[in-house]
Interface confidence: medium
C-alpha cells in the first residue's frame, strides 16, 4: 500500500514537474520581458542571499561579542595574508575595522604593518563592508519594530 | 583559533617525576610564546613556566630547579618535565599559548587547554 502511494505521488511530482518546465519554456519564448524579469529575480535573490550573510557579523549591541569578532577577525585575516591568501585575509580585515569602535586608528596602524598594495585592497574593499554594516543596523531596527 | 590539549597528569608520591604534554593545532605554532599554569581548588591560576618561540625559558621560584619546560616546534608540542614533586604542586596544569599581533602590535591572542590534574600524596 505504502509503495503505491510512493509510486502515485512520484507521478504527481514528475508530471507536475514536466507541466513546469512546458510552462516555462513557452513562457520564455512568448514574454519578451521574462528574461529581464527572470534576472531581476536572480538579482534579488542574490541580494537576499548577501544579506543573509550577514548573520555572520555580531550583534552590534553586544560589546563582548562585537570584542570576540574583532579579535577573530584581525586574526584570521593576519593568518591567511602569513599564507598568501590576501583576498581571504583582507576580507577577515575589513570585517575587523567595520566592527571597531576607532576604525581610523586602526586603519593608521594597519597602514604601517601592511604592504602597500594590501593595504590599497583593503582601502578599495571598506565601502561594500561598511554599506553591510549599515543594512545590518537598519535590520536590526526593522526587528525591533 | 588554536586548540590545546593537555596530557599526562596524574596521581604520583612526593618525591616522584611526571611529565605533561601539551599538543597545539590550528595555527603555526612556532609563532606562539607557550606556558604553563598551575590552579590550585579556591586559588588563583598562576605561572608555573614559560617558553618564548626561540626557546627562552622563564619559571617560578617556587619551580626552579625542579621543573622544565621545553617544546617540539615539529610536533607541536610544549612539555612540562616535574622531579622532585611535593604535596603543593597539587593543582589542575593548564597549557597556554599566546602571541602578539603582527599587524595590531597592541593586540594579543590568548588561547588555554582544558587543563590535566597532577595530585601529590605525601
Known amino acids: 500500500m505504502v509503495g503505491r502511494n510512493s509510486a502515485i505521488a512520484a507521478g504527481v511530482c514528475g508530471a507536475l514537474f514536466i507541466g513546469y518546465c512546458i510552462y516555462f519554456d513557452r513562457k520564455r519564448r512568448s514574454d519578451p520581458n521574462f528574461k529581464n524579469r527572470l534576472r531581476e529575480r536572480r538579482k534579488k535573490q542574490k541580494l537576499a542571499k548577501e544579506r543573509a550573510g550577514l548573520s555572520k557579523l555580531p550583534d552590534l549591541k553586544d560589546a563582548e561579542a562585537v570584542q570576540k569578532f574583532f579579535l577573530e577577525e584581525i586574526q584570521l585575516g593576519e593568518e591567511l595574508l602569513a599564507q598568501g591568501e590576501y583576498e581571504k585575509g583582507v576580507d577577515h580585515l575589513t570585517n575587523a575595522i567595520a566592527v571597531c569602535g576607532q576604525p581610523q586608528q586602526l586603519l593608521q596602524v594597519l597602514q604601517q604593518t601592511l604592504p602597500p598594495p594590501v593595504f590599497q585592497m583593503l582601502l578599495t574593499k571598506l565601502p561594500t563592508i561598511s554599506q553591510r554594516i549599515v543594512s545590518a543596523q537598519s535590520l536590526a531596527e526593522d526587528d525591533v519594530e | 583559533a588554536v586548540q590545546l590539549v593537555e596530557s599526562g597528569g596524574g596521581l604520583v608520591q612526593a618525591g616522584g617525576s611526571l611529565r605533561l604534554s601539551c599538543v597545539a593545532s590550528?595555527?603555526?605554532?612556532?609563532?606562539?610564546?607557550m606556558g604553563w599554569y598551575r590552579q590550585a581548588p579556591g586559588k588563583q591560576r598562576v605561572l608555573v613556566a614559560t617558553?618564548?618561540?626561540?626557546?627562552?625559558?622563564n619559571y617560578a621560584d617556587s619551580v626552579k630547579g625542579r621543573f622544565t619546560i621545553s617544546r617540539d616546534n615539529t610536533k607541536n608540542t610544549v612539555y612540562l618535565q616535574m622531579n622532585s614533586l611535593k604535596p603543593e604542586d597539587t593543582s589542575v596544569y593548564y597549557c597556554?599559548?599566546?602571541?602578539?599581533?603582527?599587524?595590531?602590535?597592541?593586540?594579543?591572542?590568548?588561547?588555554w587547554g582544558q587543563g590535566t590534574q597532577v595530585t601529590v600524596s605525601s
Open positions: 597556554n599559548a599566546r602571541r602578539g599581533s603582527v599587524i595590531v602590535p597592541t593586540l594579543a591572542y590568548d588561547y
Open positions: 590550528g595555527s603555526t605554532f612556532s609563532n606562539f610564546v
Open positions: 617558553i618564548s618561540s626561540g626557546g627562552s625559558t
